[in-house]
């Protein structure tokens, strides 16, 4: 006869451990007890649990209430056990030992791997700003036994670098994503892949990213100049602009207070009826917390009764 | 000797509840699992319940599921039986048996217990 | 869960005569199948264990054999202690179940 058992288990921590030992018997033969032990070098046997066709089966105390036999069906020459809840320190070798009439003693080796399936974290970088070289915009780890692979999942144009710690008995590894920061890459998600063979599926961890910036701003309204005319109703100025986050708006009169009348309401500046009074230099103040932008233009209001004509110059500050 | 002895059968209304015991002597009972086999009066045997040599895992006949629990005690060499919510479809003598070790078959018996459960 | 079928129900014997008791299990159990033996007013006894093997202490006019679903208990020679009714049970899978019993009555 001979035994039957596998070179290595592997198991998920927390899981049981089917420690599999079967006698493979001529017909008539019988066997009457199954020791299992913990044969790592160094350590010495430590003795789990002994099987014995008459006296049932015997758990060592550091193992009591660990070691069970697997449900049934069980075959009378399979002494496998089950080691519950397997946790780190029970890695390593196992033997079995089975005493078997009329053939006599067998033994085997095997290796109990147990995966520790990684709980990955993402940090997110520093605030991101238009304008910056190439920056951290994330950071992901994870921590596991064997070590886990970190890979990113993006449609951003990046560059990713990897290090590894490792420890007596897992090992971690951190996956750093770092960018040139763009507007366009607002909202845009990133993706933290996590694989582990202790892992049904890859574990995935998204941040959203957020890039500050300001768009350069610009007045829109005064593209029809002979519009702005003495007696015109529902003549506005808009300011035009973007941000992250998102700008306010602050309209002035440069060259004194806005005339009587005039409503600011956001980005857009109202008029009632045009009178020549209306005519000035008015100001649109954009700002974020990343920056500030101004965008200045000259009204010109045309009165009919003077035979002039209207002149707008549009200038833009930053 | 190896034996097993019941004990905590009796007469209990519908809805009530008893707890049978069995002491295990000449054996460690906790080096096997064990198990509850009842039988009704003028009827067959039947599985009720099983528990596992380190008390890990518990198996139930749908019949008693929810109403019944396992449970054992290695230090004191004994195994239990709480029956709750009792029908008159429990009443039965009532089994302790013991699993081999290599096979599962019952090779130890206990001399049974009755259990009555009527109005 | 696995349905087991005793056949006969009922059979009568005299002594020295040999007895079949056939057990038939609903879906494919290997040989993890048991034979007990139980008298009035007592508990079963284990008879056979893995469809084949004598448990110690049991006379060997007894024998088991079959496998998958169909599986038979033999009594070579009746004897007079061996009128009783006989109890197939799978030990497959949980929930273990038995079969109805066969009673072996004397003719």
């Known amino acids: 006869g001979e035994l039957e058992t596998s070179d290595v288990v592997t198991v998920v921590l927390g899981q049981d451990a089917k420690l599999p030992c079967f006698y493979r018997g001529d017909s008539g033969e019988q066997v009457g007890q199954v020791a299992w032990a913990r044969a790592d070098a160094g350590e010495g046997a430590q003795e789990l649990a002994l099987l014995h066709s008459k006296y049932g089966l015997h758990v060592s105390p550091a193992y009591e209430g660990r070691v069970e036999q697997p449900p049934p069906p069980r075959n009378p020459l399979d002494g496998s056990v089950l080691l519950r809840n397997a946790v780190q320190a029970d890695e390593g070798e196992y033997e079995c030992r089975v005493s078997t009439f009329p053939a006599g003693s067998f033994q085997a080796r095997l290796r109990l791997r147990v995966l520790v399936p990684p709980l990955p974290s993402l940090n997110p970088g520093p605030a991101l700003e238009e304008g910056q070289g190439l920056t951290l915009a994330a950071s992901c780890t994870a921590e596991g036994s064997p070590a886990p692979s970190v890979t990113w999942d993006t449609e951003v144009k990046g560059t990713t670098s990897s290090r590894s710690f490792k420890h007596s008995r897992s090992a971690a590894v951190t996956s750093e994503f770092h960018l040139v920061p763009s507007r366009s890459m607002n909202g845009q998600p990133l993706t933290c892949v996590v694989s582990h063979p202790g892992l049904l599926q890859d574990q995935r961890i998204t941040h959203i990213l957020h890039v500050s910036f300001l768009a350069e701003a610009s007045v829109r309204g005064l593209e029809d100049q002979n519009l702005w005319h003495v007696g015109r109703e529902g003549a506005m100025l808009k300011c035009l602009s973007e941000g992250q986050p998102p700008p306010s708006y602050n309209w002035t009169r440069l060259d004194g207070p806005l005339p009587s009348g005039v409503r600011v309401d956001g980005d857009t500046l109202g008029f009632p009826p045009l009178t020549t009074e209306h005519s000035g230099i008015y100001v649109c103040h954009v700002s974020n917390e990343f920056s500030s932008r101004d965008s200045q233009v000259t009204v010109d209001v045309l009165d009919p009764q003077e035979d002039s004509g209207k002149q707008v110059d549009l200038v833009s500050a930053s | 000797e190896v034996q097993l002895v019941e004990s905590g059968g009796g007469l209990v209304k519908p809805g009530g509840s008893l707890r049978l015991s069995c002491a295990a002597s000449?054996?460690?009972?906790?080096?096997?699992?064990m198990n509850w086999v009842r039988q009704a009066p003028g009827k067959g045997l039947e599985w009720v319940s099983s528990?596992?040599?380190?008390?890990?895992?518990?198996y139930y006949a749908d019949s008693v599921r929810g109403r019944f629990t396992i449970s054992r005690d290695n230090a004191k060499n004994s195994l239990y039986l709480q029956m709750n919510s009792l029908r008159a479809e429990d009443t039965a003598v009532y089994y302790c048996?013991?699993?081999?070790?290599?096979?599962?078959?019952?090779?130890?018996w206990g001399q049974g217990t009755l259990v009555t459960v009527s109005s | 869960d696995i349905q087991l079928t005793q056949s006969p129900s009922f059979l009568s014997a005299s002594v020295g005569d040999r007895v079949t008791i056939t057990c038939r299990a609903s879906q494919d159990i290997s040989s993890y199948l048991a034979w007990y033996q139980q008298k009035p007013g007592k508990a079963p006894k284990l008879l056979i264990y893995?469809?084949?093997t004598l448990q110690s202490g049991v006379p060997s006019r007894f024998s088991g054999s079959g496998s998958g679903t169909e599986f038979t208990l033999t009594i070579s020679s009746l004897q007079p202690e061996d009128f009783a009714t006989y109890y197939c049970q799978q030990i497959n899978s949980y929930p273990f179940t038995f079969g109805q019993g066969t009673k072996v009555e004397i003719k």
């Open positions: 048996a013991r699993g081999a070790v290599f096979h599962d078959a019952f090779d130890i």
């Open positions: 000449g054996f460690n009972l906790n080096h096997y699992n």
């Open positions: 528990v596992s040599s380190g008390g890990g895992f518990r």
């Open positions: 893995v469809a084949s």
